[in-house]
Interface confidence: medium
Amino acid sequence: QGWQAFKNDATEIIPELGEYPEPPPELENNKTMNRAENGGRPPHHPFETKDVSEYSCRELHFTRYVTDGPCRSAKPVTELVCSGQCGPARLLPNAIGRGKWWRPSGPDFRCIPDRYRAQRVQLLCPGGEAPRARKVRLVASCKCKRLTRFHNQSELKDFGTEAARPQKGRKPRPRARSAKANQAELENAY
């Protein structure tokens, strides 16, 4: 189609949108008891083999055009792809603390988007149609975040920060749980 690129490849962070962190994804459907993981200790335990410095989360820059149907952005946008291994799968204590250990199905830490930025682009359309403005959400930074299985907040933990800080002004919500659900969860923990 021979779209022409913008002359100025400057990226502008939109003041009204600014930066916003990744919304916490639901990582596990199985959540057990209301207890802080690791007893509030930092996540690097003696049984971990890797040092914090060995955790590698790479930010790979790539350039792409924003498209919407037949229309394409006049200039390409640059964003990041999060890549890299954030450490080995760790052994964690099981749900009822009998001293047995289990290995989660994936690594505890994942290299995922941490911050996003918004950028205005103008989409040029074929056939002399008027350009359309769009705001696109682009990955701005990546971070190793810890996946936690047994805690009362379904969020990704920032690497190197304290685990499961209590939330201010929020009461824990009691949930009715069936014996079957509890049993299944405990079996999953082995």
């Epitope: 913008f6 002359k7 100025n8 490849d9 400057a10 502008e12 006049a74 200039k75 205005r120 103008q122 008027a130 350009p131 359309r132 403005a133 769009r134």
Partner: nanobody, 119 residues
Framework: EVQLVESGGGLVQSGGSLRLSCAAS????????MGWFRQAPGKEREFVAT????????GYADSVQGRFTISKDNAKNTVYLQMMNLQPGDTGVYYC????????????WGRGTQVTVSS
């Protein structure tokens, strides 16, 4: 509201040049993009060039790329269209348009200025 007034049109020989101006007044601080469009007799209005009012990034239609240059002077609230190597196919009424922040299309238009390229 933004008011747009175009000027600089005229009659020119094929291969010649013209510089169009678009003076904006009113709520120009709310402007996101400014653009130039043209309409040839019996044809639909078509996009020519666009410029980001804040950053100055420019985009062009394929038919004018390399021949036309869009620029702006924020201090004068004016957008320019420098047209080089004009061809008879460039004949038409040239309109300046403004797209406001938050809008997805051009909402304000000038009355246009006539450009005629003779062979």
């Amino acid at each position: 509201e933004v008011q747009l007034v175009e000027s600089g049109g005229g009659l020119v020989q094929s291969g010649g040049s013209l510089r169009l101006s678009c003076a904006a007044s009113g709520r120009t601080f709310s402007t996101d993009f400014m653009g130039w469009f043209r309409q040839a007799p019996g044809k639909e209005r078509e996009f020519v060039a666009t410029i980001d009012w804040r950053s100055g990034s420019a985009g062009y239609a394929d038919s004018v790329q390399g021949r036309f240059t869009i620029s702006k002077d924020n201090a004068k609230n004016t957008v320019y269209l420098q047209m080089m190597n004009l061809q008879p196919g460039d004949t038409g009424v040239y309109y300046c348009a403004a797209q406001m922040i938050g809008a997805s299309s051009y909402g304000y238009w000038g009355r246009g200025t006539q450009v005629t390229v003779s062979s």
